[in-house]
Interface confidence: medium
Amino acid sequence: EDGGPACYGGFDLYFILDKSGSVLHHWNEIYYFVEQLAHKFISPQLRMSFIVFSTRGTTLMKLTEDREQIRQGLEELQKVLPGGDTYMHEGFERASEQIYYENRQGYRTASVIIALTDGELHEDLFFYSEREANRSRDLGAIVYCVGVKDFNETQLARIADSKDHVFPVNDGFQALQGIIHSILKKSCIEILAAEPSTICAGESFQVVVRGNGFRHARNVDRVLCSFKINDSVTLNEKPFSVEDTYLLCPAPILKEVGMKAALQVSMNDGLSFISSSVIITTTHCSDGS
């Protein structure tokens, strides 16, 4: 891996990749794009899934945080032989199934989808793709689209969350490498630190949550700070302010010394959460402190 910027966010990342006949001579470029991007998401809490679509959608690698499984998944991805039609909706279906199932199991982890296609979607196929992307959104996902070569940017803006969630690659497949940094910057939602990280037991505090990507939410009014206290009860708080690199949140009053609150952020009013390893602890503060 080549160092450089990385993402420390804990969420579920789905790659939905076009393997239709039109990418036959460009699969290597798609593979290397995914491989380099995948290595930049380095949180141990980040899970990844590889989905490919042509005339049907196939989950090549189910959601996993296991780095060895991801390595094997990338090997499988490299072996893919493209062919068939561009049934992008089938790819979104495979993602939604996993999001739906994970939510059902009680894992309300935030989902980010990066969908890549190289062609215009005709009539029904566009309608189905938009519909399936909407279903993924309804399940809490943030959807980004990468369009290469003969894509229709208006279509992709409707499949993705917005025009700002579309990455156009107009110079052909070899130019995919050039958007890795911007995709990483836009798709990464991460919690890096909390200030203060130690608070006084029984007192009210405001916490500054440092990170990135907090304004990537479709609606910033739906951003929440979430505190999971002693691995049991979760309290959600509405931030006083939401900026891209920090949130200002009221902290819950933790009555006892030694209590721990793990910090999470929801971008969708508590439907799903970005996890982190950031912990706020309580300490005893004397009257003078």
């Epitope: 279906e93 199934e97 739906y100 199932y101 939510n103 059902r104 519909r131 909407n134 279903r135 959104r137 309804d138 399940l139 439907l271």
Partner: antibody
């Protein structure tokens, strides 16, 4: 208690548009998923589609582009439009709710019978 | 789409007896299977969700089991009000589909 009530004409002519409204009380249509399900005489139940809490719609591909589901959050109502009806669309039409991250229809309207005939 | 097949189409049982209804999915739907009861002139009523999860207000004599493609609804001891049509529903994949129903009638 959540209640759903379907309303609309009981008779529609072939090739015309069937329009039904479901009024929801006891819950907000800005949460959960709001569905239309129908049952033709002697047939199994057929899920037609939903409108979600966010306003996204998802419909049964068998109905192709004939179906439209809309909502009016100010009245807490959602509606069904089915274009180019034929006698095969004669059925009891139900509106039903399912909860977010669920897929079982836990609350139903009592149903309204629609006959397609000239 | 996933095809749901119920058997038998009609089940004749005496009150107090046990009734076992089957539902088969054309592909693996894990436990995303729901059961409904429908009486003449009424809307369906949810009995069991996610194959075996009970609903508050539904009598304990109704129970569900199964996973994957084969599912069973059991009514341990039939009461007079249980004679109705029972439907299973695929909740795994769109479009959601229902079985053809099993009519439980008095023997």
């Amino acid at each position: 208690e959540v209640q759903l009530q379907e309303s609309g004409p009981g008779l529609v002519k072939p090739s015309e548009t069937l329009s039904l409204t479901c009024t929801v009380t006891g819950d907000s249509i800005s949460s959960d998923y709001w569905n239309w399900v129908r049952q033709a005489p002697g047939q199994r139940l057929e899920w037609m589609g939903y409108i979600s809490y966010s306003g996204n719609t998802y419909t049964n591909p068998s109905l192709k582009s004939r179906i439209t589901i809309n909502r009016d959050t100010s009245k807490n109502q959602f509606s069904l439009q089915l274009n180019s009806v034929t006698p095969e669309d004669t059925a009891v039409y139900y509106c039903a709710r399912y909860k977010t991250i669920d897929s079982s229809f836990d609350v139903w309207g009592q149903g309204t019978t629609v006959t397609v005939s000239s | 789409e996933i095809v749901m097949t119920q058997s038998p189409a009609t089940l004749s049982v005496s009150p107090g007896e046990r009734a076992t209804l089957s539902c088969r999915a054309s592909q693996n739907i894990r436990d995303f299977l729901h059961w409904y009861q429908q009486k003449p002139g009424q809307a369906p009523r949810l009995l069991i969700y996610y194959a075996s999860q009970s609903i508050s207000g539904i009598p304990a004599r109704f129970s569900g089991s199964g996973s994957g493609t084969d599912f069973t609804l059991t009514i341990s001891s039939l009461e007079p009000e249980d004679f109705a049509v029972y439907y299973c529903q695929n909740g795994h994949s769109f479009p959601y589909t229902f079985g053809g129903g099993t009519k439980v009638e008095i023997k």
